[in-house]
Amino acid sequence: CKAMHVAQPAVVLASSRGIASFVCEYASPGKATEVRVTVLRQADSQVTEVCAATYMMGNELTFLDDSICTGTSSGNQVNLTIQGLRAMDTGLYICKVELMYPPPYYLGIGNGTQIYVIDPEPCPDSDF
């Protein structure tokens, strides 16, 4: 397994609709043909997989139909969007990139993006 540098922003604030987007960039010494991107969430020393996608370079990322993630790729940059977030989902979201093909296998893990989610205040009842 060969190590690879992965960069991602330190902090992102989710929108009022619970959507957060960030770029995950991996620094490979060459052009892979098959890449796997996994988003992990770390909270209270627990790490859970949020979503994952394998894609062929030059093609779109395809997450599972029921995934909360969507994404696009351009070169070695993956633009990730996580939807349906609530305040309880605040945490460190780590981007893991694997170069699956051709060999040898490369693995890179980012330092994580702290995503802050603030639940919107409910609208006060109107007297009108």
């Epitope: 620094a27 010494p29 060459g30 052009k31 070169g75 070695n76 170069l99 051709p102 060999p103 040898p104």
Partner: antibody, heavy 119, light 106 residues
Framework: DVQLQESGPGLVTPSQSLSLTCSVT?????????WNWIRQFPGNKLEWMGY???????NYNPFLKNRISITRDTSENQFFLKLNSVTTEDTATYYC????????????WGQGTSVTVSS | DIVLTQSPSSLSASLGGKVTITCKTS??????MAWYQHKPGKGPRLLIY???ILQPGIPSRFSGSGSGTDYSFSINNLEPEDIATYYC????????FGGGTMLEIK
């Protein structure tokens, strides 16, 4: 550590074929990477010629496509360059090198072998 | 073919000083840029890949930056062993090299 070493005749006659060998130690050429030939002309210009991948597939510089062949001997962990119909313009120092992926940075190189095309 | 225009072709600098080499590509190469040091009688040595990532074992005096079609490479605190020819290489589409920059110490 990975090491690459080029060998072959230093003098080739015009219109003949140029044949070079790259011997690799410290890594199996079938385990991964692409195994390249690059040449440096007098005056220092570097030109990528082509490669043979770990799986035996090739990719060649379009400018050389009908003259070049890169093959390998997996039992000896060597790969070879054959360049047909050479002219004096093919006089250069020839290097073998390794890179990751379809295209990539060359992380290990041989020290090069000088080839002169002359009658 | 992607063409790389490297400049200057030669330069002279003082020990302890800083030098910068630029490489302009004929189209966007998505940061797939590498830099090499080449000394006579040896094969080129990979210094930097993916625009700015130092190859293991390369001193941090060497650095790279850029995006799109404009890339640069710098050496800080020049040392005598830095005398060499330096090349850029793109690996977005095929592998092509710049024309080289010969560095000498004043």
């Amino acid at each position: 550590d990975v090491q690459l070493q080029e060998s072959g005749p230093g003098l080739v006659t015009p219109s003949q074929s140029l044949s070079l060998t790259c011997s690799v130690t410290g890594y199996s050429i079938t385990s991964g990477y692409s195994w390249n030939w690059i040449r440096q002309f007098p005056g220092n210009k570097l030109e990528w010629m082509g490669y043979i991948r770990f799986d035996g597939n090739n990719n060649y510089n379009p400018f050389l496509k009908n003259r070049i062949s890169i093959t390998r001997d997996t039992s000896e962990n060597q790969f070879f360059l054959k360049l047909n119909s050479v002219t004096t313009e093919d006089t250069a120092t020839y290097y073998c090198a390794r890179n990751y992926g379809t295209w990539g940075a060359m992380d290990f190189w041989g020290q090069g072998t000088s080839v002169t095309v002359s009658s | 073919d992607i063409v790389l225009t490297q400049s200057p072709s030669s330069l002279s600098a003082s020990l302890g000083g800083k030098v910068t080499i630029t490489c302009k590509t004929s189209q966007d190469i998505n940061k797939y840029m590498a830099w090499y040091q080449h000394k006579p009688g040896k094969g080129p040595r990979l210094l930097i890949y993916y625009t700015s990532i130092l190859q293991p074992g390369i001193p941090s005096r060497f650095s790279g930056s850029g995006s799109g079609t404009d890339y640069s490479f710098s050496i800080n605190n020049l040392e005598p062993e830095d005398i060499a020819t330096y090349y850029c290489q793109q690996y977005d589409n095929l592998n092509t090299f710049g024309g080289g920059t010969m560095l000498e110490i004043k």
